[in-house]
């Protein structure tokens, strides 16, 4: 009876279990009753990082110098190239597809430490009593306005992204 499932590192095709190609190799032809799976190594600038049945290898990532990228780790037949940014610049994401001078802290966050040539901007959430309503690479969280010192009262509470709104006190007539 033909199998319905195969072992690890195998795949089911034409009612039989064939070996997957190892990392760094692509599938040329499926196995038959009489022959093993045929695999071929990936080319110079290609890779496959898993046991697979792919008929094409993936191209290594290109670290585009026009985007400030350079090679951190050269790719192999089993691994992709890892890019990083030129000195003083910072990756926009984990995949490092482009570079920025420094990242900004979003509304609700303030700058804890300004970027240097070595480290990117460090942001911190605005605690209660403080806010930031801008994206910035230098502005800290600002304290809420003190309505009391202006002889006013809080009409709208502040948040981590907005200041309090002050208004006149309701004066009761005698």
């Amino acid at each position: 009876e033909p199998p319905t499932a195969c072992r690890e590192k195998q795949y089911l095709i034409n009612s039989q279990c064939c070996s997957l190609c190892q990392p760094g190799q692509k599938l040329v032809s499926d196995c038959t009753e009489f022959t093993e799976t045929e695999c071929l190594p990936c080319g110079e600038s290609e890779f496959l990082d898993t046991w697979n049945r792919e008929t094409h290898c993936h191209q290594h990532k290109y670290c585009d110098p026009n985007l400030g990228l350079r090679v951190q780790q050269k790719g192999t037949s089993e691994t992709d190239t890892i890019c990083t940014c030129e000195e003083g610049w910072h990756c926009t994401s984990e995949a490092c597809e482009s570079c920025v001078l420094h990242r900004s802290c979003s509304p609700g966050f303030g700058v804890k430490q300004i970027a240097t040539g070595v480290s990117d901007t460090i942001c911190e959430p605005c605690p209660v009593g403080f806010f930031s309503n801008v994206s910035s690479a230098f502005e800290k969280c600002h304290p809420w306005t003190s309505c009391e010192t202006k002889d006013l009262v809080v009409q709208q509470a502040g948040t981590n992204k907005t200041d309090v709104v002050c208004g006149p006190q309701d004066r009761l007539r005698a």
Partner: nanobody, 116 residues
Amino acid sequence: EVQLLESGGGLVQPGGSLRLSCAASGFTFRDYEMWWVRQAPGKGLERVSAINPQGTRTYYADSVKGRFTISRDNSKNTLYLQMNSLRAEDTAVYYCAKLPTLFQDWGQGTLVTVSS
């Protein structure tokens, strides 16, 4: 396409002054935080000064505090850096940058040389 064109650099004696300008185009200048960044020969990038979109809040590196003044004219799409009491260690290429600054938006910079 973002374009930032720095100017105003040159050779100046220690204790002298210079005013750098940065003409911006290709984006809505008034909406962006702007920075001056410098690179001394053989050194890394140093963030010198920054200004918020409205021009009401500023940042200065400790090394230039009290000597440099950043300003902007949103009607002229221009950023400025007034540099007084210049020192030999201020010698660098000065770049202006918008936030966020992508590598490909980086200008050519203007060279400031402080020497007697």
